[in-house]
């Protein structure tokens, strides 16, 4: 009922709570002397469903049969209408339409940890749209039944707040949930279990790792568990990996030896627990322990390469380069590299430790036979040294690889191909492909890159340190014993027309011809490997097509003669540069008038 209902009553039959699809009879009746003043026969009773009129009747009472009410709550209000006055509210009623509860399904109970409390969950089934009370019962030993009620409409979880103890772990407990509302009741199927079935241990805690004698091969993982835990599973992985290694252990009593860890690697460890071999469930995984394994001495050998440069008649510069060991080979933080340089005939040797660099340059006499050895050291020891005899890598012309080509292969890759040398190809022990950014000044500080290729290969894809729109000087070496032959080529992974043309810095007259000198185009404007320069000239103030001279690009060249100019004629000259993608805009214009005699 709603409101004070002083003037009358609204009654609902059979009930204010009805099953979906049922019919209700609603009666609105006025109390004595509560009708329209002087005009009791003019009483007009009106029944509203929410704000919509559904029935009216003249007199002291109104009967209405209502069907098709939707799930949920519907409000009915009865009002009195008298002549020349507003409608007066008499009384009202709410009707609750719903369904009886369905049988709760999939009842399951769990106790988190030996000290936790029993909590159960279930599926309610479809919404009843009515106030529904759930009662969860737990029956067990000593003829005892606990029950807990939940008065929340959407109840599908209850925690009893009681703790099952392991005094008799095989004792049976039975849980059942019953849903009750005004239209009926329904109980779940009983769920029977033992302490061991439902107790889910707490995850292990206080996880630690110890390495005996700072060795990765003597590693023990320690943790703490609840008292009844019988089984553990361990999972661990390098921090940068997505794949776990799994180990199952029984009766570990909080410790386990791990034998397959890699040195100098950060690992993540987690542990889970279970009370019984085949009963119950695994705990959640513990919080992660992150720990780094100790170093071990490096394995593997450094990949070493070198470059020789002539200084003068008695001296040469040797530049050594080596690649970092992989993480799995370094097995620790590399503290320094040890470089030993030895003259093989005289036995003179010099050793130096290099930190922070992977290259070393020294000057040695051009005479004698020289060898180097390079090794990497961490806190536990050194790698085996890589030994190299210093030789003239390009001396043996017959060992030079033939038909070397360099072609762009997708983004930032260059495919280098070659043919074996003319000399017995079977003599080749390995090829080395070397590349470095092309700098017109032949700058020795430019980083050197290389890769080794097996003797039966005739191609290599180079991708390390390759940038778009940069020209690389590429050399292919064929090595055989203490001899080497080489061939070189220029290549780029991506090219376009140069952004500018060469800058003419001087024009000089020499015996009836001129010598044009220019500045190289800045590397960042070359946009790949230059193939040609073009020198253009035409008579000043002439509309004729310019003449041109095309010069093949050579790294060191920055001047060229022209001998086809007429004396005492003023010419305008300019230059462009070309890559395989096209020609640059022209560089600066210079005027020149040849003073020599006419032919």
């Amino acid at each position: 009922k709603i409101d004070a209902c002083k003037r009358g009553d609204v009654t609902v039959k059979p009930s204010h709570v009805i099953l979906l699809g049922s019919t209700v009879n609603i009666t609105c009746s006025l109390k004595p002397r509560q009708g329209c003043f002087h005009y009791s026969r003019r009483n007009k009773l009106i029944l509203y469903k929410f704000d919509r009129r559904i029935n009216f009747h003249h007199g002291h009472s109104l009967n209405s049969q209502v069907t098709g009410l939707p799930l949920g709550t519907t409000l009915f209000v009865c009002k009195l209408a008298c002549i020349n006055s507003d409608e007066i509210q008499i009384c009202g009623a709410e009707i609750f339409v719903g369904v009886a509860p369905e049988q709760p399904q999939n009842l399951s109970c769990i106790q988190k940890g030996e000290q936790g409390t029993v909590a159960c969950t279930w599926e309610r089934g479809r919404d009843t749209h009515l106030y529904t009370e759930y009662t969860l019962q737990l029956s067990g030993p000593k003829n005892l039944t606990w029950q807990k009620q939940c008065k929340d409409i959407y109840c599908d979880y209850l925690d009893f707040g009681i703790n099952l103890t392991p005094e008799s772990p095989e004792s049976n407990f039975t849980a059942k949930v019953t849903a009750v509302n005004s239209l009926g009741s329904s109980s779940s199927l009983p769920s029977t279990f033992t302490f061991l079935d439902i107790v889910r241990p707490l995850p292990p805690w206080d996880i630690r790792i110890k390495f005996q004698k700072a060795s990765v091969s003597r590693c023990t993982l320690y943790w703490r568990d609840e008292g009844l835990v019988l089984l553990n599973r361990l999972r661990y992985r390098p921090s940068n990996s997505r794949l776990w290694n799994m180990v199952n252990v029984t009766k570990a009593k909080g410790r386990h030896d791990l034998l397959d860890l890699k040195p100098f690697t950060e690992y993540e460890f987690q542990i889970s627990s279970k009370l019984h071999l085949y009963k119950g469930s695994w705990s959640d995984w513990s919080e992660s322990l992150r720990a780094q394994t100790p170093e071990e001495e490096p394995t593997g050998m450094l990949d070493v390469w070198y470059m020789k440069r002539h200084i003068d008649y008695s001296r040469q510069q040797i530049s050594l380069f080596w690649k970092n060991l992989s993480v799995s080979e370094a097995r620790g933080k590399i503290l320094h590299y040890q470089v030993t340089l030895q003259e093989l005939t005289g036995g003179k040797a010099m050793t130096q430790n290099i930190t922070g660099h992977t290259s070393w340059t020294t000057v040695i006499p051009r005479t004698g036979n020289w060898a180097v050895a390079v090794s990497a050291a961490n806190s536990k020891g050194s790698s085996l040294p890589t030994r190299i005899n210093i030789m003239n890598l390009c001396e043996a012309g017959l060992l030079a690889p033939r038909q070397v080509s360099a072609n762009s292969e997708g983004m930032d890759n260059i495919l280098v191909t070659w043919q074996p040398p003319r000399k017995d190809p079977s003599a080749v022990q390995e090829y080395v492909v070397e590349w470095r950014e092309l700098h017109p000044g032949g700058d020795t500080q430019v980083p050197l890159n290389w890769l080794r290729s097996r003797p039966y290969n005739v191609s290599a894809l180079i991708s390390e340190n390759i940038k778009s729109y940069i020209c690389y000087e590429i050399r292919v070496y064929a090595l055989s014993g203490d001899q080497g032959g080489c061939s070189s080529i220029l290549g780029n992974s991506k090219h376009k027309a140069p952004l500018s043309g060469p800058h003419i810095n001087a024009i000089t007259e020499e015996k009836g011809s001129i010598l044009i000198s220019w500045n190289s185009i800045p590397v960042q404007e070359q946009m790949g490997c230059l193939l040609h320069y073009r020198i253009y000239w035409k008579e000043r103030d002439s509309n004729s097509q310019p003449q041109l001279c095309e010069i093949p690009y050579r790294v060191s060249q920055n001047s060229h003669p022209i001998n086809s100019l007429q004396p005492r004629v003023t010419y305008v000259l300019w230059m462009t540069a070309l890559t395989a993608a096209g020609e640059s805009s022209h560089g600066n214009e210079r005027e020149f008038c040849l003073q020599g005699k006419a032919n």
Epitope: Q115, T117, G140, P141, K142, L144, W146, Q147, K148, Q149, C150, K151, F160, G161, I162, N163, L164, T165
Partner: nanobody
Framework: QVQLVESGGGLVQAGGSLKLSCAAS????????MGWFRQAPGKEREFVAV????????AYVDSVKGRFTVSRDNAKNTVYLQMNSLKPEDAAVYFC??????????????????????WGQGTQVTVSS
Amino acid sequence: QVQLVESGGGLVQAGGSLKLSCAASGGTFSSYAMGWFRQAPGKEREFVAVIMRSGDTTAYVDSVKGRFTVSRDNAKNTVYLQMNSLKPEDAAVYFCAAGRPVTRTYYHTYTYPHDYDYWGQGTQVTVSS
């Protein structure tokens, strides 16, 4: 110091009903679990039912489950035991008891007399066949 006074006992026919009340005074009623025990002549005191402080958790001995209902009204400091479908073997002196709060409630907590600090004098229930 909590005082407990039971009432509502008496003689009833088998199959009949009784409602026992237990009024508490002298303590914070809502902080105690309230239990009902019974003792027949020559037998040990037996647990019947308990209602926890919140009122939504109860426990019963299986022999009364479905017939007896324990409830409490914290505003009135009273606990009730509604007994329906009484049997001759239900005849006994019924005691009300107040149990101290515990840090952890085990399955058998509040089902033994030693779990309770305060006891009433008891009320006699007789069931005739």
